[in-house]
Interface confidence: medium
C-alpha cells in the first residue's frame, strides 16, 4: 500500500435495473485490477422532481477523477445522471451533489440510499 | 499477461449448431465477468451475450435470444457460447472480451476471435 | 436500447494531424463511455474507458472528453500506428452497445 493512499479493495453494489442487466441487485462488490492500476468506488443517481433515484453503485477502474476522494461527492452543474467515485473501502455508501459551478452558497445534499 | 484464446469456429449450414470455447489464463478468471462481441464482415462490433463471474447471470442481445447460451466452467478457466439454430446473419468473428467489473466498465481484454460461417 | 451515433464514419488525415472523432449517446450515459482501436485482422483493443482514463499502455496523444450524451475521442497528433478503425461503447445499461466506428485513413 502507498503511504496516504485509501485503498480501495470492496465496494457498495446496487443497480436498479437489475433485471434488464442481469446482475445481483445489491451487495458488495470485490474489486479487482491490474496491480499498478488504483480502484474505486462510484454512485450514479438521478434526481426526478425532488426524488433521489439510485441507479448503480459499485467499484470503478483507475480514473484520475477520483484520485485522494475519501467522499463521493459530484460536482457538475446539474447533470441528468449525477455521478461519483471515491477511494476506500464503501466510501461510496454515501454520496453528495455539491455544484461547483453556483454563484450562490452550494448546500450539501448528503444521500444514504436506503436498502430496497 | 492476460490471455483469451477463441475456438470451435467454423462453416456450418443454416439451422446447424457450434459451440464455441474461450480458454483463459493470465488472470483469476471466476473474478470477471466475461462477454461475446461479433463482427460480421466489413461490419462492427455487435455485443452478443455475457455473464457474470460465477455464471449465476448471463444476458444475451435480442438477435440471439433463445437461440444462444453463454456458460463458463471456472474449474477450466473456460467460456462457452453454444449457437443453435444458426442463420446466415450469424456469419460473424466471435471474440470473447474480458468484463472489467460485474457490471462490464469496459471490455478490457479480447481474444483474437474465431469465424462462424452459416452457409449452404 | 441506447443507440450510439459516430461522426464522421471515415476521414483522412496525415502524419502529425490533431483527429478528432465524436460519438453521441440518444440518453445520458454518464461516465460510462469507452473507445476501442481496431486494425484490420486484429481484435479490438481497449483505449480508453470512463470517457477520459487511457488503458495500459496507450500512448498520452490519445485523449477523451465528454459527459451525458455527447463525446469525443482526440489524437493530438496522429502517428502511422493510429491509421485504424475506432468504435465508441457504452456500458451504462445492457445491451452493450457500440457505435458504427470511424475509419481513419491516409491522406
Known amino acids: 500500500a502507498i503511504l496516504g493512499r485509501s485503498e480501495t479493495q470492496e465496494c457498495l453494489f446496487f443497480n436498479a435495473n437489475w433485471e434488464r442487466d442481469r446482475t445481483n441487485q445489491t451487495g458488495v462488490e470485490p474489486c479487482y485490477g491490474d496491480k499498478d492500476k488504483r480502484r474505486h468506488c462510484f454512485a450514479t443517481w438521478k434526481n426526478i422532481s425532488g426524488s433521489i433515484e439510485i441507479v448503480k453503485q459499485g467499484c470503478w477502474l483507475d480514473d484520475i477523477n477520483c484520485y485522494d476522494r475519501t467522499d463521493c461527492i459530484e460536482k457538475k452543474d446539474s447533470p441528468e445522471v449525477y455521478f461519483c467515485c471515491c477511494e476506500g473501502n464503501m466510501c461510496n455508501e454515501k454520496f453528495s451533489y455539491f455544484p461547483e459551478m453556483e454563484v450562490t452558497q452550494p448546500t450539501s445534499n448528503p444521500v444514504t440510499p436506503k436498502p430496497p | 499477461e492476460v490471455q483469451l484464446l477463441e475456438s470451435g469456429g467454423g462453416l456450418v449450414q443454416p439451422g446447424g449448431s457450434l459451440r464455441l470455447s474461450c480458454a483463459a489464463s493470465?488472470?483469476?478468471?471466476?473474478?470477471?465477468?466475461m462477454n461475446w462481441v461479433r463482427q460480421a464482415p466489413g461490419k462492427g462490433l455487435e455485443w452478443v451475450s455475457n455473464?457474470?463471474?460465477?455464471?449465476?447471470?448471463?444476458g444475451y442481445a435480442d438477435s440471439v435470444k433463445g437461440r444462444f447460451t453463454i456458460s463458463r466452467d471456472n474449474s477450466k478457466n473456460t467460456l462457452y457460447l453454444q449457437m443453435n439454430s444458426l442463420r446466415a446473419e450469424d456469419t460473424a468473428v466471435y471474440y470473447c472480451?474480458?468484463?472489467?467489473?460485474?457490471?462490464?466498465?469496459?471490455?478490457?481484454?479480447w481474444g483474437q476471435g474465431t469465424l462462424v460461417t452459416v452457409s449452404s | 436500447d441506447i443507440q450510439m451515433t459516430q461522426s464522421p464514419s471515415s476521414l483522412s488525415a496525415s502524419v502529425g494531424d490533431r483527429v478528432t472523432i465524436t460519438c453521441r449517446a440518444s440518453q445520458s450515459i454518464s461516465r460510462y463511455l469507452n473507445w476501442y482501436q481496431q486494425k484490420p485482422g486484429k481484435a479490438p483493443k481497449l483505449l480508453i474507458y470512463a470517457v477520459t482514463s487511457l488503458a495500459s499502455g496507450v500512448p498520452s496523444r490519445f485523449s477523451g472528453s465528454g459527459s451525458g450524451t455527447d463525446f469525443t475521442l482526440t489524437i493530438s497528433s496522429l502517428q502511422p500506428e493510429d491509421f485504424a478503425t475506432y468504435y465508441c461503447?457504452?456500458?451504462?445499461?445492457?445491451?452493450?452497445?457500440f457505435g458504427g466506428g470511424t475509419k481513419v485513413e491516409i491522406k
Open positions: 472480451a474480458r468484463g472489467a467489473n460485474w457490471h462490464d466498465t469496459a471490455l478490457d481484454y
Open positions: 455473464i457474470n463471474y460465477n455464471g449465476g447471470y448471463t
Open positions: 461503447q457504452q456500458s451504462y445499461e445492457s445491451p452493450l452497445t
Open positions: 493470465g488472470f483469476t478468471f471466476d473474478s470477471y465477468s
